[in-house]
Interface confidence: medium
């Protein structure tokens, strides 16, 4: 009985990919649709409401036609057939066009990044050799958290010129290790901007800034907000003097009181002389009492 189904019934051979095919049984699609015809008319598939299982048949036909992986001319027009692809399928592809990448990301728009999409992006970026600005622009537009999903090693391939594509929200989920990699790139990218413009651009990267850069910023009347200050590296904040923090925060310095129990404010307070803290007039407590000698143990260790 199954053998009877292998031949295409008379008059049902598909001459083009069109809406009539949605009424074909799966075995009829298999028998009556030529794979080469399908490949040349892939752009039509997306507009035709094939069922979930009919698409399995179409995918199978493409897999047979291109066992080594689909050419980009087919990939660009996969449309929702892309959702049927496995990461193993995608690893066979060579996607070089940003237009192809955008077309496939559009299919998955509004959903979490699937393993298929992650594999596609990985293939694309590796093919390009680096995460250039246009690619980063595209990826962060579809997935604002994309940048923070990369390892510090992967982030090291981001050229400083690409940093211009990064928006503050793209860094929301980055951890300190990632910001440590991104901050020097941002510093380089924005180095020719003037003080206030520079601060606006660099602000969201400051979780990777070292002490000396924070000291330099404190001399520029930047008025850093508390949310940014709370994301700074604790080890970078600890050496700052009360006067430097006051200059860094400007009118926002009053917010320290509300954060005095949280890092890095808590740890910073413990390192300051209490009478220096008192000059802020905020009632911050926990500093080093007057008359106590402050030993810089890190310096002592370095000398021994």
């Amino acid at each position: 009985r199954e053998v009877e189904k292998t031949a295409c019934p008379s008059g049902k051979k598909a001459r083009e990919i069109d809406e009539s095919l949605i009424f074909y049984k799966k075995w009829e699609l298999e028998a009556c649709v030529d794979a080469a015809l399908l490949a040349t008319q892939m752009d039509r598939v997306n507009a035709i409401p094939f069922t979930y299982e009919q698409l399995d048949v179409l995918k199978h036909k493409l897999d047979e036609l291109y066992p080594q992986g689909y050419p980009e001319s087919v990939i660009q027009h996969l449309g929702y057939l892309f959702l049927k692809m496995s990461p193993e399928d995608i690893r066979k592809w060579n996607v070089t066009s940003l237009e192809t990448l955008k077309a496939l990301l559009e299919v998955n728009k509004g959903h979490e990044m699937s393993p298929q999409v992650a594999t596609l992006i990985d293939r694309f970026v590796k093919g390009r050799g680096q995460l250039d600005k246009d690619t980063l622009d595209t990826l962060t537009a579809f997935y604002p958290g994309y940048l923070c999903s990369l390892s510090p090693e992967e982030l090291s391939s981001v050229p400083p010129s690409s940093i211009w594509a990064v928006r503050p929200q793209d860094l929301d989920t980055c951890d300190p290790r990632q910001l440590d990699v991104l901050y020097p790139k941002a510093r380089l990218a924005f180095q020719n901007m003037n003080g206030s413009e520079y601060f606006v651009k660099i602000q969201s990267f400051l979780g990777g800034a070292p002490t000396e850069d924070l000291k330099a910023l404190s001399q520029q009347n930047v008025s850093m907000d508390l949310a940014t200050f709370m994301k700074l590296r604790t080890d970078a904040v600890l050496p700052l003097t009360v006067a430097e923090v006051q200059k860094l925060l400007g009118p926002h310095v009053e917010g320290l009181k509300a954060e005095e129990r949280h890092r890095p404010v808590r740890d910073w307070i413990l390192r300051q002389r209490q009478d220096d803290l008192d000059t802020l007039g905020l009632g911050l407590q926990g500093g080093i009492p007057n008359g106590y000698l402050v030993l810089d143990l890190s310096m002592q260790e370095a000398l021994s």
């Epitope: 009424f23 049984k25 035709i48 069922t51 979930y52 009919q54 929702y80």
Partner: nanobody, 119 residues
């Protein structure tokens, strides 16, 4: 098993509009294509409109193109048929259907809702 329940049918004057809804329940998910069929008295059941499982691809019978719009809300497991510029020949029982396979096999059907276009 998939259960489909249609609503929104009724009596309407020529040129009027109706919006049919079909709520799916049971073993359904967003991988089902959904469709509206209709059957007029003494005629065979015919397909009216289809929407695929992503909501991207659609199909309309020639007789309703430009007048009817099919849409779906996957989180609500509901498919809609917006019918404008209704004509007397649109009078029929409208059935909601769902399949993952094809419209000629493994298709689930609703009970139908009557649409009457008359002055």
């Amino acid at each position: 098993q998939v259960q489909l329940v249609e609503s929104g049918g009724g009596l309407v004057q020529p040129g009027g509009s109706l919006r049919l809804s079909c709520a799916a329940s049971g073993r359904t998910d967003s991988t089902y294509n959904m469709a509206w069929f209709r059957q007029a008295p003494g005629k065979e059941r015919e397909i009216v409109a289809v929407i695929n499982w992503t909501g991207g691809g659609t199909y309309y019978a020639e007789s309703v193109k430009g007048r009817f719009t099919i849409s779906r809300d996957n989180p609500k497991n509901t498919v809609y048929l917006q019918m404008n510029s209704l004509k007397p020949e649109d009078t029929a029982v409208y059935y909601c259907a769902a399949t993952r396979t094809s419209w000629t096999e493994n298709t689930y059907w609703g009970q139908g809702t009557q649409v009457t276009v008359s002055s």
